[in-house]
């Protein structure tokens, strides 16, 4: 890709609101936009919540004064709201739009998500910060579909299962599934949380030896691509605390038990070197098969430089460093 | 444009069974719940019951447990509610709306109503 | 099942008059509520939901307020074309249910 530094467009957004912490190419009626994510901002719709955050919208060519918009996602100016039986939100501080994501087709919606948002029902012993995300309509204008992929009824303890999950921290769209990461789940082992549009049902990750390796934040970043073969799905998840080095798994979603089945896993090669907490799954040699570029931002030969690792598909899952 | 169309008025016998229905258009059912609320003569709303499209699963006011049936087909995008061993109580008229995948959201479209009169 | 009790059953305002309907939960709905309009022979529309926020297209003068257990609805300067049965309902926990209603009329 070539960039042109000479004629950038520019554009800016409230003061201290994190703007430009998620950004999203969306197009919908021959519009194209920047979408975004202000996760620190105030929301002029939800004017008694502090600083839930925001997701604004950027027209790229008609626009000459270069002015985003806040997206109205009609979610109420209440603290307390029911959201099920056993939980009430809380979206004080919640960081919306710490992360975007776009369904890739025509009409494709986006993923917007908050992962501090909490659940509250239960604040005398615990305050669940389930986080949440929303699916706002490719239009950016009518009302979207909200979710909470970690929320059961009566469920109640921090850190348990999914008590503290925060759910898209990352979070990705592919044309059938939404996919979560969501690092806190099972005293922050972690987990990603698929959801299937087809009939809306979530995938489960049920490998008990992944759910047991607490503190390794799986879910820190989430990506998906065609890994298996040309025309199926495999989610892909990063833990970049796992053993202190990261970690990197691929998993195929398996429609017919409804469940995540491992495929593939690679380690980092250096401590605190956060290996897994950045993703890219893309065709490199255009065999039809998507291969894997893993961000490690803190691995250091000479200061801190970062580095990233290329996995290339041979096919089948078996991907080569 | 998103709109509820409903099926024609039905003029049917005590202990007989009726199916109505709900096409939608401008939306896909898939991405809603489908809501049936009764209306009975001068009165006010009944909550039948609701059904997630994309799966089928059905939820009902216990009420009408045994006298009501939703159903959804999404490749044609209608919802039905069948009613069945049908007497005067019946007689009311029976609503579709859609509910988005919104937790605090609510009814924000309405089919146009379809008249059920029981009667011998 | 929550009960909703809804009032005045029927109310009549003049022109340009404040109009409040009040309705209560029988256990605390945590602002699960909407309001329903319904005009002579025509299906409910959707005005206010999330007990507070008003829907697209609905005119400023509705507005939706309370918590708890209660809940009213305010018509700041009562039109003509307000001439209507109004509905609350909880969306709290099923069955869903609704208030027996209000008709509002024109003096």
């Known amino acids: 890709y070539n960039l042109d530094p000479q004629r950038p467009v520019h554009f800016q957004g409230p003061a201290d609101s994190f703007f430009g912490y998620a950004v999203l190419e969306h197009f919908h009626d021959n519009t194209r936009w920047v979408l975004v994510g202000a996760p620190k901002a105030d929301s002029k719709y939800s004017p008694s919540v502090k600083s839930p955050g925001a997701v604004f919208k950027c027209r790229v060519h008609t626009n000459p004064d270069r002015r985003c918009t806040e997206l109205d996602m009609a979610r109420g100016k209440n603290r307390g709201t029911s959201c099920g039986k056993t939980c009430r939100e809380d979206r004080d501080d919640e960081w919306m739009g710490v992360s975007l994501a776009r369904q890739p087709k025509a009409d494709g919606r986006v993923l917007a998500c908050a992962h501090r948002w909490k659940n509250i029902y239960y604040e005398a012993d615990h305050i669940l910060p389930h986080g949440f995300c929303y699916i706002i309509p490719s239009n950016l204008q009518a009302k979207g579909r909200t979710l909470i992929p970690c929320y059961e009824e009566y469920k109640k303890k921090y850190g348990e299962e999914h008590g503290s999950c925060q759910a898209g921290i990352a979070g990705f769209f592919t044309e059938e599934l939404v996919v979560m990461g969501a690092p806190g789940s099972f005293y922050w082992a972690g987990t990603i949380k698929v959801l299937n549009l087809t009939d809306n049902t979530y995938l489960k990750l049920n490998d008990e030896v992944i759910m047991n390796r607490r503190y390794t934040y799986l879910g820190y970043a989430v990506t998906a691509g065609h890994f298996s073969h040309p025309s199926t799905i495999d989610v892909v998840g990063g833990a970049p605390q796992d053993k202190g080095i990261g970690k990197v798994y691929i998993f195929r979603a398996d429609r017919r038990s409804g469940t995540l089945i491992k495929i593939f896993q690679a380690s980092g090669k250096k401590m605190g070197s956060y290996f897994g907490s950045s993703l890219c799954a893309v065709d490199l040699n255009g065999d039809g098969l998507s291969d894997l570029l893993v961000g490690a931002p803190m691995f250091s030969e000479i200061r801190d430089e970062g580095q990233v690792t290329v996995y290339i598909n041979r096919g089948n899952g078996a991907l080569e460093e | 444009e998103v709109q509820l169309q409903q099926s024609g008025a039905e003029l049917v016998k005590p202990g007989a069974s009726v199916k109505l229905s709900c096409t939608a258009s401008?939306?896909?059912?898939?991405?809603?719940?489908v809501h049936w609320v009764k209306q009975r003569p001068e009165q006010g709303l009944e909550w039948i019951g609701n059904?997630?499209?994309?799966?089928?699963?059905?939820k009902y006011d216990p009420k009408f447990q045994g006298k009501a049936t939703i159903t959804a087909d999404t490749s044609s995008n209608t919802a039905y509610l069948h009613l069945s061993s049908l007497t005067s109580e019946d007689t009311a008229v029976y609503y579709c709306?859609?509910?988005?995948?919104?937790?605090?959201?609510?009814?924000?479209?309405w089919g146009q109503g379809t008249s059920v009169t029981v009667s011998s | 099942d929550i009960q909703m009790t809804q009032s005045p059953a029927s109310l009549a305002a003049s022109v340009g008059e404040t109009v409040t309907i009040t309705c209560r939960a029988s256990e605390n709905i945590y602002y699960s509520l909407a309001w329903y309009q319904q005009k002579q022979g025509k299906s409910p529309q959707l005005l206010i939901y999330n007990a507070n926020s008003l829907e697209d297209g609905v005119p400023s003068r509705f507005s939706g307020s309370g918590s708890g257990t209660q809940y009213s609805m305010k018509i700041n300067s009562m039109q003509p074309e307000d001439t209507a049965t109004y509905f609350c309902?909880?969306?709290?926990?099923?069955?869903?249910?609704f208030g027996g209603g209000t008709k509002l009329e024109i003096k």
């Open positions: 401008g939306f896909n059912i898939k991405d809603t719940y």
């Open positions: 309902k909880q969306a709290y926990d099923v069955p869903y249910t």
């Open positions: 059904i997630d499209p994309a799966n089928g699963n059905t």
């Open positions: 709306a859609r509910w988005l995948r919104h937790f605090y959201y609510a009814m924000d479209y």
